[in-house]
């Protein structure tokens, strides 16, 4: 569900939304940390209806979801190099 990508691409999000998406409708979350050509952290959400949206990292609801996913993944060993997928 949660992926962290370290790429050498520029920013991919033109605009960000803070509109709430319940986790039941989220298929996958991708996080691109600040740096590597983009001055800001980016969060991209793939929804169950196949649409994709960039989410404001400051939105409280996305922070809650990511915190829950991090807690859930703390018992599983990390996936090495470039891409970290948190089930």
């Amino acid at each position: 569900v949660l992926e962290v990508y370290y790429t050498h691409l520029r920013c991919r999000c033109v605009q960000e939304s803070s509109v709430f998406i319940p986790r039941r409708f989220i298929d996958r979350i991708q996080i691109s940390p600040r740096g590597n050509g983009c001055p800001r952290k980016e969060i991209i959400v793939w929804k169950k209806n196949k649409s994709v949206v960039c989410v404001d990292p400051q939105a409280e609801w996305i922070q809650r979801i990511m915190e829950m996913l991090r807690k859930k993944s703390s018992s599983t060993p990390p996936v090495p190099v470039f891409k970290r997928k948190i089930p």
């Epitope: 709430f20 998406i21 039941r24 929804k47 649409s51 609801w61």
Partner: antibody
Framework: EVQLVESGGGLVQPGGSLRLSCAAS????????MSWVRQAPGKGLEWVAT????????YYPDNVKGRFTISRDNAKNSLYLQMNSLRAEDTAVYYC????????????????WGQGTLVTVSS | DIQMTQSPSSLSASVGDRVTITCKAS??????IAWYQQKPGKAPKLLIH???TLQPGIPSRFSGSGSGTDFTFTISSLQPEDFATYYC????????FGGGTKLEIK
């Protein structure tokens, strides 16, 4: 008081179409996602569709995807379900239900339901 | 898709009895389960959400527990108005209802 009133049900032949409506009152309709849930005679509940508060996102289970379309008109406080290519197995009472509060971040499920409208698909 | 296995499918009990219904999810749904009561010819009524949070106005004799894949709904002391059909709903990944439990008078 939250009120949801469904209409538009009736008898339709297999392969036919029907449009259900749900009139909402007693809450700020445009702030809530809305869903349709159905119940075949003597059977359990089955989720049919959900639409986000602004109407930009819709979600369906595989068995109705491509046949059913959920929509809403926030100016009229109304929810709709367009049903095409109807089959005998679509026969059910169709309930309109209020879903999550779109302006918040609570993972709440459907809380208020209408009394339902009966759709019968038969030749 | 997540499956919800609800048991028993029917149950006979008497006023004052303690009644327990279980729902088992085919995968981890965290605590995202709700319980509904439905009476014949009526719409479902939400009793509990997020496993154990009681809806406003719902009597405290209704309770829920569990996490992950195994969940329990309990009525501590059955009242005459509690005889109905009960459904669980998972809302962690889209929506799936359990098959229902018909609670009848013994």
């Amino acid at each position: 008081e939250v009120q949801l009133v469904e209409s538009g049900g009736g008898l339709v032949q297999p392969g036919g179409s029907l449009r259900l409506s749900c009139a909402a009152s007693g809450f700020t309709f445009s702030s809530y996602a809305m869903s349709w849930v159905r119940q075949a005679p003597g059977k359990g509940l089955e989720w049919v569709a959900t639409i986000s508060e602004g109407g930009s996102d819709a979600y369906y289970p595989d068995n109705v995807k491509g046949r059913f379309t959920i929509s809403r008109d926030n100016a009229k406080n109304s929810l709709y379900l367009q049903m095409n290519s109807l089959r005998a197995e679509d026969t059910a009472v169709y309930y309109c239900a209020r879903d999550y509060y779109g302006s918040g971040y609570e993972e709440s499920p459907m809380d208020y339901w209408g009394q339902g409208t009966l759709v019968t698909v038969s030749s | 898709d997540i499956q919800m296995t609800q048991s028993p499918s029917s149950l006979s009990a008497s006023v004052g009895d303690r009644v327990t219904i279980t729902c088992k999810a085919s995968q981890d749904i965290n605590k995202y389960i709700a319980w509904y009561q439905q009476k014949p010819g009526k719409a479902p009524k939400l009793l509990i959400h997020y496993t154990s949070t009681l809806q406003p106005g719902i009597p405290s004799r209704f309770s829920g527990s569990g996490s992950g894949t195994d969940f329990t709904f309990t009525i501590s002391s059955l009242q005459p108005e509690d005889f109905a059909t009960y459904y669980c709903l998972q809302y962690d990944n889209l929506y799936t209802f359990g098959g229902g439990t018909k609670l009848e008078i013994k």
